[in-house]
Amino acid sequence: EEELQVIQPDKSVLVAAGETATLRCTATSLIPVGPIQWFRGAGPGRELIYNQKEGHFPRVTTVSDLTKRNNMDFSIRIGNITPADAGTYYCVKFRKGSPDDVEFKSGAGTELSVRAKPSAPVVSGPAARATPQHTVSFTCESHGFSPRDITLKWFKNGNELSDFQTNVDPVGESVSYSIHSTAKVVLTREDVHSQVICEVAHVTLQGDPLRGTANLSETIRVPPTLEVTQQPVRAENQVNVTCQVRKFYPQRLQLTWLENGNVSRTETASTVTENKDGTYNWMSWLLVNVSAHRDDVKLTCQVEHDGQPAVSKSHDLKVSAHPKEQGSNTAAENTGSNER
């Protein structure tokens, strides 16, 4: 038994960020005369939260009217709670002293824990595009959550990934925490439409996890396959050679026709057709005037895709002594080669 006891009935209080925290405190006596003060933390570095005697504390309101006679309820409310408000709060009775007030009795303290939602996960992929069969890393970050316990999962097109590493910082006590995770993903040619999803579950989200996504379309590069073919004669002395550029992504592509190594024409892919898997096809043709050539012609379709080194495919066009007799089999020998 004591002359005066300061009672803080709640050992801990859990409040969501943005809400109001109620910290309860009652005294068993009003004697001796002196103010109640609230502090966060203990010892010389403690932070004054409220002083009944004096001061301006805009975020703090008293639960009851402290100017009312015989009031022994010194509970306070703190508005707009943030993770930075977490800590142990002490209700302390002071007694009038000469010249200064003297700490008389302290409550046992109430630990305020702040539940703060994690920020929306941000997923980022590699700086440079990569081709199928390569492994790329994706990172996911979310910040500002409390308490520390959190669950992070990775998915690719709804399938959970297992090859990832996750860290929650800091390791020790903090007002709020951050999570950082790196997942490894093996690219396939079908990944243009694929999504990588980072899913974060936290107590503050009430079973409705937050998701961050990255489209593999921003990461993948599917190099084209080339096929050069000779079409039937359109008119006498003319041969139509086509270059089929298939299954490439992204669309950025430049094609150059070479006749015996000399640039004949350069064009940029424009009216492409899109495949179901999100890759593109494009076709370019070259009309060759056979009569203009005395010797065989080596036609090369050279493609520069997405800033990568050019790939090419060649087609040999045989020129005979009697062009007028040339039919649709002018290039009876069609030797193709991939040159890089």
């Epitope: 038994e1 004591e2 009003l30 005369v33 015989n70 007694r95 008389f104």
Partner: antibody, heavy 114, light 111 residues
Framework: QVQLQESGPGLVKPSQTLSLTCTVS????????VNWIRQPPGKGLEWIGI???????DYNSALKSRVTISVDTSKNQVFLKLSSVTAADTAVYYC????????WGQGTTVTVSS | DIVLTQSPASLAVSPGQRATITCRAS??????????MHWYQQKPGQPPKLLIY???NLESGVPARFSGSGSRTDFTLTINPVEANDAANYYC?????????FGGGTKVEIK
């Protein structure tokens, strides 16, 4: 139950130091303060000072230079020392519990005389 | 120092009547919404006994015939109805400011 009992010499010579003891029971001296109050014959009450549960003290400024209040919590005793006494210090001396003064001892009479 | 002036100095009351004692402080004894004024009864050869604390609160075990009121500088102790064993000296006391002080006392006699 709560009890306080003052004890000490009934007669003190002028200029000497008056020493009194208040022995308490039924409460803890670490939880409650103890006051000393005196009452000259046929007169009113005068507060001398208090020792709080943490051992800190507050004294009547009129007597401060001559008064010392101390405590021995292990013996449940509070002590009053009043130095350089004169006949004006003749009084019944009481100890009383806490700021509320809800329990008093019976008092002990101290006469200052040569 | 806060000086407490009690009036009257003495008072004779018949049993069953009302006795009113006033205590005026030289400055306010109010702090933090409360009046740190208390009332004691002292009978001859006995220590004072707490009757009322914080101006108006009846101490445990004290008959409800005793009541206190007032704030800041003006306080009243009322005994209604007075009984024969209420004959005693009555003191007001403040512990709002050091040094704590007592009033000079009011002697209540029963007619």
């Amino acid at each position: 139950q709560v009890q306080l009992q003052e004890s000490g010499p009934g007669l003190v010579k002028p200029s000497q130091t008056l020493s009194l003891t208040c022995t308490v029971s039924g409460f803890s001296l670490t939880g409650y303060g103890v006051n000393w109050i005196r009452q000259p014959p046929g007169k009113g009450l005068e507060w001398i000072g208090i020792i709080w549960g943490d051992g800190s003290t507050d004294y009547n400024s009129a007597l401060k230079s001559r008064v010392t209040i101390s405590v021995d919590t292990s013996k449940n005793q509070v002590f009053l020392k009043l130095s350089s006494v004169t006949a004006a210090d003749t009084a019944v001396y009481y100890c009383a519990r806490a700021g509320k003064m809800d329990y008093w001892g019976q008092g002990t009479t101290v006469t200052v005389s040569s | 120092d806060i000086v407490l002036t009690q009036s009257p100095a003495s008072l004779a009351v018949s049993p069953g009547q009302r006795a009113t004692i006033t205590c005026r402080a030289s400055e306010s004894v109010d702090s933090y919404g409360n009046s740190f004024m208390h009332w004691y009864q002292q009978k001859p050869g006995q220590p004072p006994k707490l009757l009322i604390y914080l101006a108006s609160n009846l101490e445990s075990g004290v008959p409800a015939r005793f009541s206190g009121s007032g704030s800041r500088t003006d306080f009243t102790l009322t005994i209604n109805p007075v009984e024969a064993n209420d004959a005693a000296n009555y003191y007001c006391q403040q512990n709002n400011e050091y040094p704590w002080t007592f009033g000079g006392g009011t002697k209540v006699e029963i007619k």
